[in-house]
């Protein structure tokens, strides 16, 4: 015999106590499949959480972080301060990147200059706090006399944290 | 030499999902960025998003977050790229790319992979 | 996002002709600009990278050149195999972002 519940759609749910019926999920709540006993709970934006997509009746509210603020784990669980390009976020707040290390974005952590010579290449632009450096051709391919290394590119707004 | 090498070809229904792989051989897979780009048909080049495998951070474009997820695997050297919820207008060559010696452009190119959404 | 504005998107040219392409981000990006070859099979390269470096094995007819937000990929002397289509990239903000494209055939 078929189960009667699974004619149920998406945003309602099989109420036993009304014999089975599929009745609306509740207000505050959803049901994203078809075939529910139950209707789930939406999730709240509160406090350092902002909405970012409303709670229907199938489908569950999505947050975000209010601003000054970045996402972590998975459907944006927690929230985390954002530091300045050149910096990490760290127990006691956010620090200045170290010297041979930079971070061009609002968060994420101080990563390593490229080391262009691993690659066969020379330095073409020097390394920030907030830049990486830009490798260039392998030395071999400067001509003599040319200057290889470029003064580094004033920072703005991120790439991403290369190498 | 670098090489970059993906998946083959795949068709796939809407709504179904598809995972894309990349696969890096000649250089240290830990040490360059693999970036995604979406070419749709007739279309120019669209940036999807990177990830450093050598911690798995990941950059995403706005425009891509609820749609792909970029993973790696440090073991086999590969990346990966997984839609979901497919729909017609995910039909497009995905290309994975290395990046360059921190200059952000892409020095490395797999030969693209051909997905098409179709009922 | 950074706004990549291409042109021309087309251009055909004889063998020999001196070919330019410009490519204008919506704002600064210092010299953070790329440029790619598309070939009809769907190959890409990258040719110069960092506004005006060419890249190890790129002919030298390529040249590129700019700041800012206004630069310029030059072909010095068409040549047959040049029939691509070019791209430019900004590479200083995230998502990066592609020019539309300029497609290139040979008169």
């Known amino acids: 015999l078929q189960d009667p519940c699974s004619n149920c759609p998406a945003g309602t749910f099989c109420d036993n106590n009304r014999n089975q019926i599929c009745s609306p999920c509740p207000p505050n709540s959803f049901s994203s499949a078809g075939g529910q006993r139950t209707c789930d709970i939406c999730r709240q934006c509160k406090g350092v959480f902002r909405t970012r997509k409303e709670c229907s009746s199938t489908s569950n509210a999505e947050c975000d972080c209010t601003p000054g603020f970045h996402c972590l784990g998975a459907g944006c669980s927690m929230c985390e301060q954002d530091c300045k390009q050149g910096q990490e976020l760290t127990k006691k707040g956010c620090k200045d990147c170290c010297f041979g290390t930079f971070n061009d974005q609002k968060r994420g952590i101080c990563r390593p200059w490229t080391n262009c010579s691993l690659d066969g290449k020379s330095v073409l632009v020097n390394g920030t706090k907030e830049r990486d450096v830009v490798c260039g051709p392998s030395p071999a391919d400067l001509s003599p006399g040319a200057s290889s290394v470029t003064p580094p590119a004033p920072a703005r707004e991120p790439g991403h944290s290369p190498q | 030499q670098v090489q970059l090498v993906q998946s083959g070809a795949e068709v796939k229904k809407p709504g179904a999902s598809v995972k894309v792989s990349c696969k890096a051989s000649?250089?240290?897979?830990?040490?360059?960025?693999i970036n995604w780009v979406k070419q749709a048909p007739g279309q120019g080049l669209e940036w999807i998003g990177n990830?450093?495998?050598?911690?798995?951070?990941?950059n995403y474009n706005q425009k891509f977050k609820d749609k792909a997820t970029i993973t790696a695997d440090k073991s086999t050297s590969t990346a990966y790229m997984e839609l979901s919820s497919l729909r017609s207008e995910d039909t497009a060559v995905y290309y994975c790319?290395?990046?360059?010696?921190?200059?952000?452009?892409?020095?490395?190119w797999g030969q693209g992979t051909t997905v098409t959404v179709s009922s | 996002d950074i706004q990549m504005t291409q042109s021309p998107s087309s251009l055909s040219a004889s063998v020999g002709d001196r070919v330019t392409i410009t490519c204008r981000p919506s704002?600064?990006?210092?010299?953070?600009l790329n440029w790619y070859q598309q070939k009809p099979g769907g190959t890409v390269k990258l040719l110069i990278y960092?506004?005006?470096r060419l890249r190890s094995g790129v002919p030298s007819r390529f040249s590129g050149s700019g700041s800012g937000t206004d630069f310029t990929f030059t072909i010095s002397s068409l040549q047959p195999e040049d029939i691509a289509t070019y791209f430019c990239q900004q590479g200083d903000t995230l998502p990066y972002t592609f020019g539309q494209g300029t497609k290139l055939e040979i008169k």
């Open positions: 990830i450093y495998p050598s911690d798995s951070y990941t």
């Open positions: 790319t290395r990046d360059y010696g921190s200059s952000y452009s892409f020095d490395y």
């Open positions: 960092y506004t005006s």
């Open positions: 000649g250089y240290t897979f830990t040490s360059y960025w």
């Open positions: 704002q600064d990006i210092s010299n953070y």
